[in-house]
Amino acid sequence: TKTESSSRGPYHPSECCFTYTTYKIPRQRIMDYYETNSQCSKPGIVFITKRGHSVCTNPSDKWVQDYIKDMKEN
């Protein structure tokens, strides 16, 4: 699911998640991540894949939390 631009102001990154991916992204395909802005209507973690795709995920999902721990540790 591509992220969509938010029109709420000059935030960086200026994107919000409106839907979440319906599948897990293999860990080895992920290069980076960021949290969407707190003013977005839904919380979101955006994973950036090695191919440059942005994928919106639900921060409450166990696998998302575990991926983030991995990336913080490495």
Partner: antibody, heavy 122, light 109 residues
């Protein structure tokens, strides 16, 4: 074909400790999400024990009743262990290793070992 | 603690018939649909049949159908075959735990 094999099951006395090992064949945990242990007492149903995230951070999740007495660990890229302590007769069961390798957001156990039998008796 | 209750057990039906198994969770599974069904035959490990409440696992015939959301779920097996005789378990995933139902034995006569 991916497979899991459990080992370490034994006949032990009450109060004893035991370590069970789950070994993955033809895949490593980089292609898995969660590795788990499930047990089944003779003639009874399935009981979830614990899961460990297969990535480097190795986050662990336990059934309430298993916390403090059972410990799940990832000991290599292809092995997971379950340490059992203070065993009682109620822990007598077949212990299954189960893996979640599917891409669904939910983590379901699509890969199972054949199980290893733990018998606790004096 | 989350409790998954399965009914009825056991259940029997004739070859070619239909059986329905219910699974009720004491609280909503995560995302309302993180529920699976497993088939277990005597002396064998369980086999994933349905995941995400209604999706068919790989290699499972379309005679198996899962439905439901939140706390109430159903597994329906139609056009029963002798090979469907087994114990079926529901399994829910919650925010940080998993759990199994008590199992329902299906006997195909």
């Amino acid at each position: 074909c991916q497979s899991l094999e459990e080992s370490g099951g034994d006949l032990v006395k009450p109060g004893a400790s035991l370590t069970l090992t789950c070994t993955a064949s033809r895949f490593d945990f980089s292609s898995a999400y969660y590795m788990c242990w499930v047990r089944q007492a003779p003639g009874k149903g399935l009981e979830w024990i614990a899961c460990i995230y297969a990535g480097s951070s190795g986050g662990t999740y336990y059934a309430t009743w298993a916390k403090g007495r059972f410990t799940i660990s990832k000991t290599s890229s292809t092995t997971v262990t379950l340490q059992l302590t203070s065993l009682t007769a109620a822990d007598t069961a077949t212990y299954f290793c189960a893996g979640s390798t599917g891409n669904s957001r939910g983590s379901y156990f699509n890969l199972w070992g054949q199980g290893t039998l733990v018998t606790v008796s004096s | 603690a989350q409790v998954l209750t399965q009914t009825p057990s056991p259940v029997s039906a004739a070859v070619g018939g239909t059986v329905t198994i219910n699974c009720q969770s004491s609280q909503s599974v995560y995302d309302n649909n993180w529920l699976a069904w497993y088939q277990q035959k005597l002396g064998q490990p369980p086999k994933l049949v349905i995941y995400d409440a209604s999706k068919l696992a790989s290699g499972v015939p379309s005679r198996f159908k899962g439905s439901g959301s939140g706390t109430h779920f159903t597994l329906t097996i139609s056009e029963l075959q002798c090979d469907d005789s087994a114990t079926y378990y529901c399994q829910g995933e919650y925010s940080d735990i998993w759990g199994f139902g008590g199992g329902t034995e299906v006997v195909v006569k």
